[in-house]
């Protein structure tokens, strides 16, 4: 269940997709990736206030218990709901190869 | 890829399954659930230091970028990798019904 998309904390403060530019050095990939040399990394960042983009029943429980026991139970966390594929040109022992990664770049976000 | 299960922060400090006792009132379920009246809620709590239980490539990227830009990119977050089903006896207009929920209780945890 994808709950409310209205952020009570103000525009852009709640869980959403962000793009962060990163070099191969930043990612620790310089030893094995040839291209692309810069990656537009899409990731999920932002707060998860009550029922905002709650992924499922577990997220709703977590919200309730966090309200009761904030020191014990953390608030839900902003994580990928789905991913976009990304193709990398990699070094291999014999030369290079194209490899598709399906779990690398976030496509959509929710709170869990 | 399920990376290292050794917690560098000390025993029990890293992402793992915890059990929290909660009443129907705590969960906000008192109006519609008849049984159980107390739930042993299993949830994922704990820190996600570098490469600890990294769920996938995205988690590894997040770790790298968090190290570089801690104010911009959050560390990976401890969330359920899978769920256990739970049966609730619910009130209905005509009486009661048994309903199975598949996304309610965490079974296993990872960092993402």
């Amino acid at each position: 269940a994808r709950n409310g998309d209205h952020c009570p904390l103000g525009p852009g403060r709640c869980c959403r997709l962000h793009t962060v530019r990163a070099s191969l050095e930043d990612l620790g990939w310089a030893d094995w990736v040839l291209s692309p040399r810069e990656v537009q990394v899409t990731m999920c960042i932002g707060a998860c206030p009550s029922q905002f983009r709650a992924a499922n029943m577990h997220a709703q429980i977590k919200t309730s218990l966090h309200r009761l026991k904030p020191d014990t139970v953390p608030a839900p966390c902003c994580v990928p709901a789905s991913y976009n594929p990304m193709v990398l040109i990699q070094k291999t022992d014999t030369g290079v190869s194209l490899q598709t990664y399906d779990d690398l770049l976030a496509k959509d976000c929710h709170c869990i | 890829a399920r990376n290292g299960d050794h917690c560098p922060l000390g025993p029990g400090r890293c992402c793992r399954l915890h059990t929290v006792r909660a009443s129907l009132e705590d969960l906000g379920w008192a109006d519609w659930v008849l049984s159980p009246r107390e739930v042993q809620v299993t949830m994922c709590i704990g820190a996600c230091p570098s490469q600890f239980r990294a769920a996938n490539m995205h988690a590894q990227i997040k770790t790298s970028l968090h190290r570089l830009k801690p104010d911009t990119v959050p560390a990976p977050c401890c969330v359920p990798a899978s769920y256990n089903p739970m049966v609730l006896i619910q009130k209905t207009d005509t009486g009661v019904s048994l309903q199975t929920y598949d996304d309610l209780l965490a079974k296993d945890c990872h960092c993402i």
């Epitope: 310089a30 040839l34 291209s35 692309p36 040399r37 899409t42 594929p85 193709v87 990398l88 | -």
Partner: antibody, heavy 119, light 112 residues
Framework: QVQLQQPGAELVKPGASVKMSCKAS????EGWYIHWVKQRPGQGLE????????????NHAQKFQGKATLTVDTSSSTAYMQLSSLTSEDSAVYYC????????????WGQGTTLTVSS | DIVLTQSPSSLSVSAGEKVTMSCRSS???????????LDWYQQKPGQPPKLLIY???NRAHGVPDRFTGSGSGTDFTLTISSVQAEDLAVYYC?????????FGGGTKLEIK
């Protein structure tokens, strides 16, 4: 199979704008960049810019800034290039091509759209 | 901008002969791992270009092994070991070392 489909031809008047399409099929559209290349009749190849369908981010060769606007519609796996304030210098074949990033070879090309600017 | 100069601008050979064509860059295209960001394309009359060689020496999928790329830094060569009638085309080199991506002026191969 993997392909990029482009309309064969566009005929437009000087001063007008045109929006040409490039429909991807046979591969995950958001996994690859789309590049655009211009070829004037009997001439060589000129890179115009790229679009990253994952983010919508674009980069243009300086020469084409203000001339070309690159967009994508991920729901239909289609990339678009709009050319504005057309003159006879814009008459050319325009190719879309895919690459794994901004710095990668173009392994699949569309057949090209022939743009004729004439009154 | 990086300038690529191809030579000769045209050449005419008989089927079965060996052909070499040159591409010279105004600056080095060599990156860390001994790979150069230089590619070769073949464009037959009335057709779009087709990728032959990428990252200076790697044959694209389905390209016959009579096509070989070599060179490093600023000087590159495309060799066709035994020219076939179907190789009639214009051959372009392209650098993607930096933006803007640039192409050479092309070498037109004619078959006697």
């Amino acid at each position: 199979q993997v392909q990029l489909q482009q309309p064969g031809a566009e005929l437009v008047k000087p001063g007008a704008s045109v929006k040409m399409s490039c429909k991807a099929s046979g591969y995950p559209f958001e996994g690859w960049y789309i590049h655009w290349v211009k070829q004037r009749p009997g001439q060589g190849l000129e890179w115009m810019g790229w679009n990253n369908p994952r983010t919508g981010l674009t980069n243009h060769a300086q020469k084409f800034q203000g001339k070309a606007t690159l967009t994508v519609d991920t729901s239909s796996s289609t990339a678009y290039m709009q050319l504005s304030s057309l003159t006879s210098e814009d008459s050319a074949v325009y190719y879309c091509a895919r690459g794994v990033g901004a710095d990668a070879a173009f392994d699949i090309w569309g057949q090209g759209t022939t743009l004729t600017v004439s009154s | 901008d990086i300038v690529l100069t191809q030579s000769p601008s045209s050449l005419s050979v008989s089927a079965g002969e060996k052909v070499t064509m040159s591409c010279r860059s105004s600056q080095s295209l060599l990156w860390k791992h001994g790979y150069n960001y230089l590619d070769w394309y073949q464009q037959k009359p009335g057709q779009p270009p087709k990728l032959l060689i990428y990252l200076d020496r790697n044959r694209a999928h389905g390209v016959p092994d009579r096509f070989t790329g070599s060179g490093s830094g600023t000087d590159f060569t495309l060799t066709i070991s035994s020219v076939q009638a179907e190789d009639l085309a214009v051959y372009y080199c392209m650098q993607s070392f930096e933006t803007p991506i640039t192409f050479g002026g092309g070498t037109k191969l004619e078959i006697k």
